[in-house]
Amino acid sequence: GSERTCCPVNWVEHERSCYWFSRSGKAWADADNYCRLEDAHLVVVTSWEEQKFVQHHIGPVNTWMGLHDQNGPWKWVDGTDYETGFKNWRPEQPDDWYGHGLGGGEDCAHFTDDGRWNDDVCQRPYRWVCETELDKASQEPPLL
């Protein structure tokens, strides 16, 4: 495939990445799959600057990101190291709360109304943000 040099229509370019902001809600796994089908991934926040950019675009709305601990350790969907990476949890989060009564704890991370992160039940239908890097090879065949 060819290297992507500009963002697809309706995506927003920022710091060599392209972002797409949903206006509807999906469960985390469905949001994750949506982004993958777009040759992208749920947003991976690697800096305070990127956090502010995403926060500005989503507003005060619960929004999924590409961070989960469904297998135990916290993991970013693109393989970015959680331990050494940027974190912006709300105070006392993540808490893996069981009190919702839906079964299990809380395994998926989202932006809250103030932008800081919370873990929540992955089945909740929140908005989501997809991200893809401009410098990565596209799956699409090159234009002739």
């Epitope: 297998n71 135990g72 006392e92 989060q93 993540p94 808490d95 069981y98 079964g103 704890g105």
Partner: antibody
């Protein structure tokens, strides 16, 4: 490398007390719930207690409720289990485990005998 | 409390065999199930979480399946290092509960 190291086990008389510690390293301790799980000699695993990342939520098995207290110190990357009114049936290897058990310590043996 | 029942409690098998261990929950637990391996005198090792997700570093000869109340752990080709005790655990709700274990021995 993720490491959990338990300490504080030993031989105690029935009715006595013991405090177990678990020192964590190699991961962001404050991002994870932590647990104590025990295994009596020749028996299966038994969940004992869990504590959320910031101690907001604490859970106990009925068999230890009112006698055991779980706590943590995120500044010290440490998990604790205060065990009071110990009984012979509390004799076991006690393991500390992260989240749902993705990593475990090597265990510390607690023996309750007169 | 949710009871977890494993079968068989023990089995004998040869190197190269494919084996399956079953775990049944007394009520539906969706996919909130983990599998562990334990060798004598050692701490348990996590193999699978969320019923079918292989833990990092665990070889692909291990696989898990199931949802609701019935779950299986399969080892596709037993190797000498796989002879151990295997147990399941539900984390759907507190108190978390374990199966009684299945001891896999050399035939």
């Amino acid at each position: 490398e993720v490491q959990l190291v338990e300490s504080g086990g030993g031989l105690v008389k029935p009715g006595g007390s013991l405090r177990l510690s678990c020192a964590a390293s190699g991961f962001t301790f404050s991002s994870y719930s932590m647990n104590w799980v025990r295994q009596a000699p020749g028996k299966g695993l038994e969940w004992v207690s869990s504590i959320s990342s910031s101690s907001s939520y604490i859970y106990y098995a009925d068999s230890v409720k009112g006698r055991f207290t779980i706590s943590r110190d995120n500044a010290k990357n440490s998990l604790y289990l205060q065990m009071n009114s110990l009984r012979a049936e509390d004799t076991a290897v006690y393991y500390c485990a992260r989240d749902r058990g993705s990593c475990w310590g090597q265990g510390t043996l607690v023996t309750i005998s007169s | 409390d949710i009871q977890m029942t494993q079968s068989p409690s023990s089995l004998s098998a040869s190197v190269g065999d494919r084996i399956t261990i079953t775990c049944r929950a007394s009520q539906g637990i969706s996919n909130y199930l983990a599998w562990f391996q334990q060798k004598p005198g050692k701490a348990p090792k996590s193999l699978i979480s969320a019923a079918s997700s292989l833990q990092s570093g665990v070889p692909s000869k291990f696989s898990g399946s199931g949802s609701g109340t019935d779950f299986t752990l399969t080892i596709s080709s037993l190797q000498p290092e796989d002879f151990a005790t295997y147990c399941c655990q539900q984390y759907h709700s507190y108190p978390w509960t374990f199966g009684q274990g299945t001891k896999v021995e050399i035939k």
